[in-house]
Each structure stands twice: as C-alpha cells, then as structure tokens.
C-alpha cells in the first residue's frame, strides 16, 4: 500500500511540475523591467523565452515574438533547448508512469515490469526537473550579469543635460515557476525511484520458505534483490507472499483523489 | 459615441473641498485608464491624476499629492476626482481624459471650471 | 520629472505653406522595449478642449489629416503641416507619455500671417 501510494503521490508531484515547467517555459515573465529607479512608469517592459512585450499605462499591451533564430544570443537558445527537452523527457516520463502505476491494469502486465517502467519514469522525470533547474539558473545568471551591466553605464548623455535610461532587467514570475517545477519535478522523479524499489515482489525479502520439486528439494532463503537490479530480474520465479496467499480479489487498488489521472 | 461629461465645478474658497464626477458613455468604461488634465485660466495643459483600470492603480501630479484623490466607480461609469485643501492655484478648467494606445488622451470631456477665491 | 520644451512659442506661417513646431524632452522617451518614442502631440483650438493628433511620437490618430505629420526619437521632436489650412490655426502641445508625471510643453501658437 505504501508503495503504491508513494508511487501515485510521484506521478501527482510529477504531473504538476511538468505542468509548471510548461507554464514556465511558454510565460512571458522570464525578465521583467526592474522599477527601483522609476516605480511609477507609465511603460512597463516585459521579456519572456519567445517574445518581449510592452504593457502601457493606458492597459495597451503589444507583444513582439522574436522572429529570428540566428539573431538571438547563444545563451537564450540554450535555455530554450534546455526548457523543451525537460518537457519532451517530462511527457514521456509520464506516459510511461501512467502504464506503471500500480492501480492500473494493463492486460498480464507482470509486477516487474511495472518496476523497470517506474523506474524509467523516475530517471526522467530527475533528468527533466534537472533541465528545468539549470535553463531557468541560465537565464537568471544571464540577468543578473546584464542587470550588473546595465547598473555600471546606468546613464549616459551629453554634459549631463539630456539623460537616457537604460532599462534593466530582473527576474521575473516565470523564473520562480520554474524553479518551483522543475524541483517538483525532481522530487516526483525521486518518489518513483524509490517505489520502484518495492514494486517487484521477487525483490522482496520473504521468510524462508521450501519448494518441494520432484526428486529434490530448493529452499528459497532470506536476503532478495537489491533494487538496483531491477531490469532484467527472474520473473519465472512463482510468487509466494509472506502470510499466506492471497487472492487476486484481495491485491486492489482503492479510490483516492489521484484516480482522475 | 463616446462621451465624457465632467460636472461638479464651481466657487470655493481657499482650503475648502470639492468632489468632481465625470460621466462616461460610449465605451466600456472599466477596460480604460483614465486620467483629470487641468488648465488654469490663459495657460498650459497640466496632467492632474491618473487611475488605471482593473486593480485601479492611482499616479498624482507632485503638486496635487496628498490633497486630490482619484477614483472611478466602474459600475456607475464614472470617474471622480476628490479635491481638498484647495489652494488659489488649483483655480483651473479640469478635463476628464480617456487613455488609449501611446498612453495618449484619445477623448476629452469639455471640462467644469474650478474657481478658488476668497 | 521630465522637462518637455517647445519652440517657437508662436509661429506665424501663410496658408499652403509648411508649418513646423519642435518639441526637446530632457529625457529620452524612446522605450528600448519596443522601439516606440512615448511623446504625443495635441491640438487645441480656443474655447474647446485639446485633440489627440499623434502619438508615439509618429502615428497619426485616426480622422487626423495627412497633412500632419510627427517625426523624431529620444529627445528631439518635430510636428510638421505640410500646407496650412485656416482651420489649423490652434494652440499645440507636445506631452511626455513615457513616465510619470505626465508632462507637456508650454505650447505653441500657431497663427496664420
């Protein structure tokens, strides 16, 4: 039972950091104009990973994507890069959890299996959170090194008689959700790897018990897998549960608030 | 059409209050900023206050800070601009603006004359 | 704040002929965010309230005639009728839309000689 609840709580926990990597990744908010020299602007500038955007005073709002693929710095295409392959890692890491839960039945789909996929699902779901993590750190070491930047020629001009003020930048709400994410992401990757540990019940430690074959005898004795081998574990091996047998009926799975997945 | 009519002006004396209205038709009130821009008697344009629209964010001219207080009731369509301590330079025609693109006043109201005399 | 001053003070231009007004802030209005210079020009005829005739420094307001034109970026500014009609004779004005306080020119009389 506590297997399976850790593992459907990792898929959840997953599920809505992929859903926040997403949201973090399409949000327009990456870089937002940093206000501590003029609170009161009436133009309010805006940056997100595919377009910058202007919000006026007057609620006027125009976004400009950015039509160019060569023209854009390195670092940014990297953050792009990073933010979708944790998404496509994400995606299939829950498409692959999904068929591994153990509340869901597929076909003769044996327990092991369900480990090797769960297991699977955790690597990716790490990898993706790790993405996440590291595009959104990226983009905000870019930040903070341009905000620097900009702070160092913060005014220029002729002799001090006209003044121009060059926009910075700080962090904006699609850094915090990315952040958020992608460790929500990693934490649910964590949570499958370890109920992938006690999925597989010939990984289990059982009490010694005695197969009588014709001829001779095999004793099964304490001291199972470890779980790291999971892949490629005996799965021709009867399953014999400690305290009895018990029926197909018996092993369920019971509602819970995760069954809409 | 959109129409803005500005109305509560008149005589007060120095340190009194007033309260002007502006009632606005033709468009969907709640989704602009507004904005009160005054002219005293022969001068320039001065922009007064300015309340955005949604969470109503209220920005004031340093000259009237603290004194006038801009509000809107989006469900009566009208904007108000609450005037106190009234000083002789407050004296003025104030206009009811609306913003648009460019943060640009696109409509003007025809304004109610504001008269600060003892 | 941002000081927007305008000159001429008053200009007198024949009819037909071109008119040009100049507006200097002593701020850069142009927002690097969209290229887009936060200056607005009015037009405002005795007795009635001012009129909106340009914004972001270069975009004509709808039913505005052509023959206004608004051109410059950063701090310089300049609003051109490119042939004087009677009914342009106004009083016009320049104003700071890009931060707050809202600020606008002295103005600029505009007569026909």
């Known amino acids: 039972m506590a297997v399976t609840a850790c593992q459907g709580l990792g898929f959840v926990v997953s599920l809505i950091g992929i859903a926040g990597i997403i949201a973090a990744t399409c949000m327009d908010q990456w870089s937002t104009q940093d206000l501590y020299n003029n609170p009161v602007t009436a133009v309010f500038n805006y940056q997100g990973l595919w377009r910058s955007c202007v919000r006026e005073s007057s609620g006027f709002t125009e976004c400009r994507g950015y039509f160019t693929l060569l023209g854009l710095p390195a670092m940014l295409q990297a953050v792009r890069a990073l933010m979708i392959v944790g998404i496509v890692l994400g995606a299939i890491g829950l498409l692959v959890s999904i068929f591994a839960l153990k509340c869901i039945r597929i076909g003769s789909m044996e327990d092991s299996a369900k480990a090797n996929m769960t297991l699977t699902s955790g690597i990716m779901f790490i990898v993706s959170g790790l993405c996440a993590i590291a595009g959104v750190s990226v983009f905000a070491n870019m930040l903070v090194t341009n905000f620097w930047m900009s702070t160092a020629n913060m005014y220029t001009g002729m002799g001090g008689m006209v003044q121009t003020v060059q926009t910075r930048y700080t962090f904006g709400a699609a850094l915090f959700v990315g952040w958020v994410a992608g460790g929500l992401t990693l934490i649910g990757g964590v949570m499958m790897c370890i109920a992938c540990r006690g999925l597989a019940p010939e990984e289990t430690n059982y009490k010694a018990v005695s197969y009588h074959a014709s001829g001779h005898s095999v004793a099964y004795k304490p001291g199972g897998f470890k779980a790291s081998t999971g892949f490629g574990s005996n799965t021709k091996n009867k399953k014999i549960y400690d305290g009895g047998a018990r029926t197909e009926d018996e092993v369920q799975s019971y509602p819970s608030k995760h069954d809409y997945v | 059409e959109v129409q803005l009519l500005e109305s509560g002006g008149g005589l007060v004396q120095p340190g009194g209050s007033l309260r002007l209205s502006c009632a606005a038709s033709?468009?969907?009130?709640?989704?602009?900023?507004m904005s009160w821009v005054r002219q005293a008697p022969g001068k320039g344009l001065e922009w007064v206050a300015t309340?955005?629209?949604?969470?109503?964010?209220?920005y004031y001219a340093d000259s009237v800070k603290g004194r006038f207080t801009i509000s809107r009731d989006n469900s009566k369509n009208t904007l108000y601009l609450q005037m106190n301590s009234l000083r002789a330079e407050d004296t003025a025609v104030y206009y009811c603006?609306?913003?648009?693109?460019?943060?640009?006043?696109?409509?003007w109201g025809q304004g109610t004359l504001v008269t600060v005399s003892s | 704040d941002i000081v927007m001053t305008q000159s001429p003070d008053s200009l007198a231009v024949s009819l037909g002929e071109r008119a040009t007004i100049n507006c200097k802030s002593s701020?850069?209005?142009?927002?690097?965010?969209?290229?887009?210079?936060?200056l607005t020009w009015y037009q405002q005829k005795p007795g009635q309230p001012p009129k909106l005739l340009i914004y972001?420094?270069?975009t004509r307001e709808s039913g505005v005639p052509d023959r206004f034109s608004g051109s410059g970026s950063g701090t310089d500014f300049t609003l051109t009728i490119s042939s004087l009609q009677a009914e342009d004779v106004a009083v016009y004005y320049c104003?700071?839309?890009?931060?707050?306080?809202?600020?606008f020119g002295q103005g600029t009389k505009l007569e026909i000689k």
């Open positions: 701020q850069s209005l142009l927002n690097s965010g969209n290229q887009k210079n936060y």
């Open positions: 603006t609306r913003l648009t693109k460019g943060n640009a006043m696109d409509y």
């Open positions: 104003q700071n839309d890009y931060s707050y306080p809202f600020t």
């Open positions: 309340i955005s629209s949604g969470v109503s964010y209220t």
């Open positions: 033709g468009f969907t009130f709640s989704s602009y900023t």
């Open positions: 972001w420094a270069s």
